[in-house]
C-alpha cells in the first residue's frame, strides 16, 4: 500500500476519505487506527456501526467521527479541532473476524493555522458577504507519498 | 443457477507442471472469493488459499505458500490452481468453493463447490 | 494459524438417533464457525454457518450451538441419508481451516 497524504489546518476539520471495492468488502464492518511506530500495532481510534447495515450512521470518538458509505464503497474520517499532536500515520482498515485488511494508509499533517499571526496586520477577516462557516471549509489537501520518501524516517 | 465447474482429472509425472481450473456461471464471478481445497487420499479437507477475481488480492495458507499459484481470469470468470513441479505428495481430491456473501455480514463460508478435479502424480 | 479440533472422529448411530459431534478451536472464534456435510467422491455441503444459523435448504433436525472455542452440531433424529463425515471450519481468520472429519456410519 502506498501512503496517501492528506493535509489540514490547525484548529479546523479534516476530512479523509478511504476508497474501496464494496463487493469485496461487502458486510465488513470498517475501523480507523493510529500506526504506533513502523512496525508497531495499529491502535484502533474509532470503528463503524456495531450492525453493519447502519454503517452509515456516523460514529465518534472524541474529535474523530467515522461513517461508511458501503454502497459507494468509500469510508469517511473527520478530525475535528485538528490539534498537531493529530499528525501521524493511519490506516483505514476492514474487518472481518479477528482479521483486519488495510484500505488506505494515511499520513496526516498538521499545518500552522495561517490566521493565527500575532500581528494584526496578517489577520484576515471575512467579508460582509462571506460567512464565518465559509472561513473554516473542511480541508482535505492529499497526495500520494512520492517514490523514495520514507513513511517513518529513521530516529537517530 | 450458480455453478462452479471444474477441469477435468490429471495424470502426471512427478516435476511436471500443472495448472487445473475453476470456471463460474450463474453468478457475478468478480464479486467473489473464490478458495482451493485439498483433500489427499482418504483424508480430510485442507484449506489451501483464496482469491478475490476482481482485483486478484490472494490469500494462502501457510502451508501451501510457495508450493502452488492461485490466479484467476475474471474476463472468463475462471480461477486456476497451478504448480511448476508436482510431487507424488501432491496426489489429490482438489476443490474451489465460492465463498459466501451475506446481505447483511461478511462471510467465510463456501456455499457453492466445484465437483473436485483428481490429480494423480506417479512416476 | 487457528487450529480447529472435532471429536469423536468415527461414531456409530442408528436411524432415529440423535447425534452430536463436537468442534474445539484452539482460539476464541466468536461465532465464526461452518458445518459441511461430505459424501464419498461428493463435494461437501454447507449446513451451518455462524455457529448456528441454518442454510437455506438444509433438514431442520440439524443444529449448532457455541461461541467462542467450543462448537456442537446435533443431528436430533438421523435419517439414513444423513451418514456421511461431517467437518467444521473456523471463518474467523485465515487460513479458514477445517476440523480433521468426523465420520458418522451405521451401527
Known amino acids: 500500500h502506498n501512503t496517501t497524504v492528506f493535509q489540514g489546518v490547525e484548529g479546523q476539520s479534516l476530512q479523509v476519505s478511504c476508497p474501496y471495492d464494496s463487493m469485496k468488502h461487502w458486510g465488513r464492518r470498517k475501523a480507523w487506527c493510529r500506526q504506533l511506530g513502523e512496525k508497531g500495532p495499529c491502535q484502533r481510534v474509532v470503528s463503524t456501526h456495531n450492525l453493519w447495515l447502519l454503517s452509515f450512521l456516523r460514529r465518534r470518538n472524541g474529535s474523530t467521527a467515522i461513517t461508511d458509505d458501503t454502497l459507494g464503497g468509500t469510508l469517511t474520517i473527520t478530525l475535528r479541532n485538528l490539534q498537531p499532536h493529530d499528525a501521524g500515520f493511519y490506516q483505514c482498515q476492514s474487518l472481518h473476524g479477528s482479521e483486519a485488511d488495510t484500505l488506505r494508509k494515511v499520513l496526516v499533517e498538521v499545518l500552522a493555522d495561517p490566521l493565527d499571526h500575532r500581528d494584526a496586520g496578517d489577520l484576515w477577516v471575512p467579508g460582509e458577504s462571506e460567512s464565518f462557516e465559509d472561513a473554516h471549509v473542511e480541508h482535505s489537501i492529499s497526495r500520494s507519498l512520492l517514490e523514495g520518501e520514507i513513511p517513518f524516517p529513521p530516529t537517530s | 443457477e450458480v455453478q462452479l465447474v471444474q477441469s477435468g482429472a490429471e495424470v502426471k509425472k512427478p516435476g511436471e507442471s500443472l495448472k487445473i481450473s475453476c470456471k463460474g456461471s450463474?453468478?457475478?464471478?468478480?464479486?467473489?472469493?473464490i478458495a482451493w481445497v485439498r483433500q489427499m487420499p482418504g483424508k480430510g479437507l485442507e484449506w489451501m488459499g483464496i482469491i478475490y477475481p476482481g482485483d486478484s488480492d490472494t490469500r494462502y495458507s501457510p502451508s501451501f505458500q510457495g508450493q502452488v499459484t492461485i490466479s484467476a481470469d475474471k474476463s472468463i470468470s475462471t480461477a486456476y490452481l497451478q504448480w511448476s513441479s508436482l510431487k507424488a505428495s501432491d496426489t489429490a481430491v482438489y476443490f474451489c468453493a465460492r465463498q459466501r456473501t451475506f446481505y447483511y455480514d461478511s462471510s467465510g463460508y463456501f456455499d457453492y463447490w466445484g465437483q473436485g478435479t483428481l490429480v494423480t502424480v506417479s512416476s | 494459524d487457528i487450529q480447529m479440533t472435532q471429536s469423536p472422529s468415527s461414531v456409530s448411530a442408528s436411524v432415529g438417533d440423535r447425534v452430536t459431534i463436537t468442534c474445539r478451536a484452539s482460539q476464541g472464534i466468536s461465532n465464526w464457525l461452518a458445518w459441511y456435510q461430505q459424501k464419498p467422491g461428493k463435494a461437501p455441503k454447507l449446513l451451518i454457518y455462524?455457529?448456528?444459523s441454518l442454510q437455506v435448504g438444509v433438514p431442520l433436525r440439524f443444529s449448532g450451538s457455541g461461541s467462542g472455542t467450543d462448537f456442537t452440531l446435533t443431528i436430533s433424529s438421523l435419517q439414513p441419508e444423513d451418514f456421511a463425515t461431517y467437518y467444521c471450519q473456523q471463518a474467523d481468520s485465515f487460513p479458514r481451516n477445517f476440523g480433521q472429519g468426523t465420520k458418522l456410519e451405521i451401527k
Open positions: 455462524a455457529a448456528s
Open positions: 450463474g453468478h457475478s464471478f468478480t464479486n467473489y472469493w
